[in-house]
């Protein structure tokens, strides 16, 4: 059979080989398509309800005024010329429809390096056969399930037209230190060969590099946090990040009701000041980051180091903030 590819909605003429150019003709067209269950016979004399779909022209050709999905199938003509010689024509018809230009919707303007991000959703509407969508990064194909690339696809079919809508959602994990303005595009490749791909307009999201969080350092004076009664302890919270974050203080896991400050002074230490202290740095972009905890204890006269496990009451005593 001769393969014929026809665009949906366009007319198609199939020649009946060996048919006399004018009536009277002895010919018969048989079709087995989505509109038939077995073979439907059409003859030159037989104008009727099928004429809207396929009719025999005066020269014996079969005319399809507007090819549809249901016209895919086999078309055969059997003709006898004036000398009684029989000729058969056999066609396999496939139909196609090119969709509109694909589009990227819900596209991200910014991606974060090192974590998965949704780049956008590529949508193609009105194709037949379905075809495929593929993504490109800087002009090179992106392979799903490789190097932090994942793609979620969906195919829907219009209940009346039978045409397909394709959707493809791209997720990527940009590498740290990579291209700050990658170029993504998406292309539709038709299901039938010999038709070029359709590509979307590109998108160029910015890649934001989160600053690696350096540790919040808590320095205690005197070193070790052990002090004689009535002595002074100075706690300093050192945060390398710029701009300087807000520093809050915790004692025994409970926030101290004090204004933010990088330095906490405990003058005239008493038993109630004993406990575990830490500072919390709050960055506008990262959220809170807590330091290690240090233990403040009172050394009774004659003792060498901090009293083991002694924690004072919850009273704050006299606190000074620098």
């Amino acid at each position: 059979a001769q393969n014929i590819t026809a665009r949906i909605g366009e007319p198609l003429v199939l020649k009946c080989k060996g048919a006399p150019k004018k009536p009277p003709q002895r010919l018969e067209w048989k079709l087995n398509t989505g509109r038939t269950e077995a073979w439907k016979v059409l003859s030159p004399q037989g104008g009727g309800p099928w004429d809207s779909v396929a009719r025999v022209l005066p020269n014996g050709s079969l005319f399809l005024p507007a090819v549809g999905i249901q016209d895919e199938g086999i078309f055969r003509c059997q003709a006898m010329n004036r000398n009684g010689k029989e000729t058969k024509s056999n066609y396999r018809v496939r139909v196609y429809q090119i969709p509109g230009k694909p589009e990227i919707v819900d596209s991200a303007s910014e991606l974060t390096a090192g974590v998965p991000n949704k780049v956008g959703t590529c949508v193609s509407e009105g194709s037949y056969p379905a075809g495929t969508l593929s993504w490109h990064l800087d002009g090179k194909p992106l392979v799903p399930n490789e190097k932090g690339v994942s793609v979620k696809e969906q195919t829907r079919r219009h209940p009346e037209t039978g045409l397909f809508t394709l959707q493809s959602e791209l997720m990527v994990t940009p590498a740290r230190g990579g291209d700050p303005r990658p170029t993504f595009s998406c292309s539709f490749s038709p299901g039938l060969p010999r038709h070029r791909a359709l590509r979307t307009a590109p998108i160029q999201p910015r890649v934001w590099e989160p600053v690696p969080l350096e540790e919040v350092q808590l320095v205690v004076e005197p070193e070790g946090g052990a002090v004689a009664p009535g002595g002074t302890v100075t706690l300093t919270c050192e945060v390398p990040a710029q701009p300087s974050p807000q520093i809050h203080w915790m004692k025994d896991g409970v926030p101290l009701p004090l204004p933010p400050s990088p330095v906490l002074i405990l003058p005239e230490i008493g038993p109630q000041d004993q406990g575990t202290y830490s500072c919390v740095a709050t960055h506008s972009s990262h959220g809170p980051q807590e330091s290690r905890a240090v233990s403040i204890s009172i050394i009774e006269p004659g003792e060498e180091g901090p009293t083991a496990g002694s924690v004072g009451g919850s009273g704050l005593g006299t606190l000074a903030l620098a």
Epitope: E37, P49, W50
Partner: antibody, heavy 119, light 107 residues
Framework: EVQLVESGGGLVQPGSSLRLSCAAS????????MTWVRQAPGKGLEWVAS????????YYPDSVKDRFTISRDNAKNSLYLQMNSLRAEDTAVYYC????????????WGQGTLVTVSS | DIQMTQSPSSLSASVGDRVTITCRAS??????VNWFQQKPGKAPRRLIY???NLADGVPSRFSGSRSGTDFTLTISSLQPEDFATYYC?????????FGGGTKVEIK
């Protein structure tokens, strides 16, 4: 909403002529074949004529061929049936209907107009 | 020409009954059969298209089936508003042919 409204029926004498009209609305008229169907009093439905969407091709049963002519004016969304050499047996309610080809069959009907042929 | 032989020509039934009407085509007409309901003094209304498909706005108690050249309209549970005359139509070939009709009356 699809609407088909027939007009032009009435009482005529045998041998005379009558022209029926059908005004269509609520759909893209030139996308559809159109058909006339009739129903004699107390009887069943009988196909009278069909026309393709462009108006280039017309179809009739033997009972009315050469006497009736179906036509359309796509600019006016109108369908017509010219009936000549009317006979008593043409007495019926004439319905305008959308369709007539294999894509639709017949789906929507007008309310009908009565044609009486009697002396 | 194709003949569409519709049976029965009339039937009496009660509300709630299951009703079956058949049209037999004299030759293969594929799936190209519609069913219509007509009430006295009114235009026909399409119920089923292409043998088995329910038309928009038609209650689901109506259904159509096909076996070769036999086409069946079934009303699963007859309602008071279903008492009417029913016609099949073959539209595979000209002349378009209607069945003779089935009048469904109240028992």
């Amino acid at each position: 909403e699809v609407q088909l409204v027939e007009s032009g029926g009435g009482l005529v004498q045998p041998g005379s002529s009558l022209r029926l009209s059908c005004a269509a609305s609520g759909f893209t008229f030139n996308n559809y074949w159109m058909t006339w169907v009739r129903q004699a009093p107390g009887k069943g439905l009988e196909w009278v004529a069909s026309i393709d969407n462009s108006g280039d091709n017309t179809y009739y049963p033997d009972s009315v061929k050469d006497r009736f002519t179906i036509s359309r004016d796509n600019a006016k969304n109108s369908l017509y049936l010219q009936m000549n050499s009317l006979r008593a047996e043409d007495t019926a309610v004439y319905y305008c209907a959308r369709g007539g080809d294999i894509t639709t069959g017949i789906d929507y009907w007008g309310q009908g107009t009565l044609v009486t042929v009697s002396s | 020409d194709i003949q569409m032989t519709q049976s029965p020509s009339s039937l009496s039934a009660s509300v709630g009954d299951r009703v079956t009407i058949t049209c037999r085509a004299s030759q293969d007409v594929g799936i190209y059969v519609n069913w219509f309901q007509q009430k006295p003094g009114k235009a026909p209304r399409r119920l089923i298209y292409r043998a088995t498909n329910l038309a928009d706005g038609v209650p689901s108690r109506f259904s159509g089936s096909r076996s070769g050249t036999d086409f069946t309209l079934t009303i699963s549970s007859l309602q008071p508003e279903d008492f009417a005359t029913y016609y099949c139509l073959e539209f595979d070939e000209h002349p378009l042919t209607f069945g003779g009709g089935t009048k469904v009356e109240i028992k």
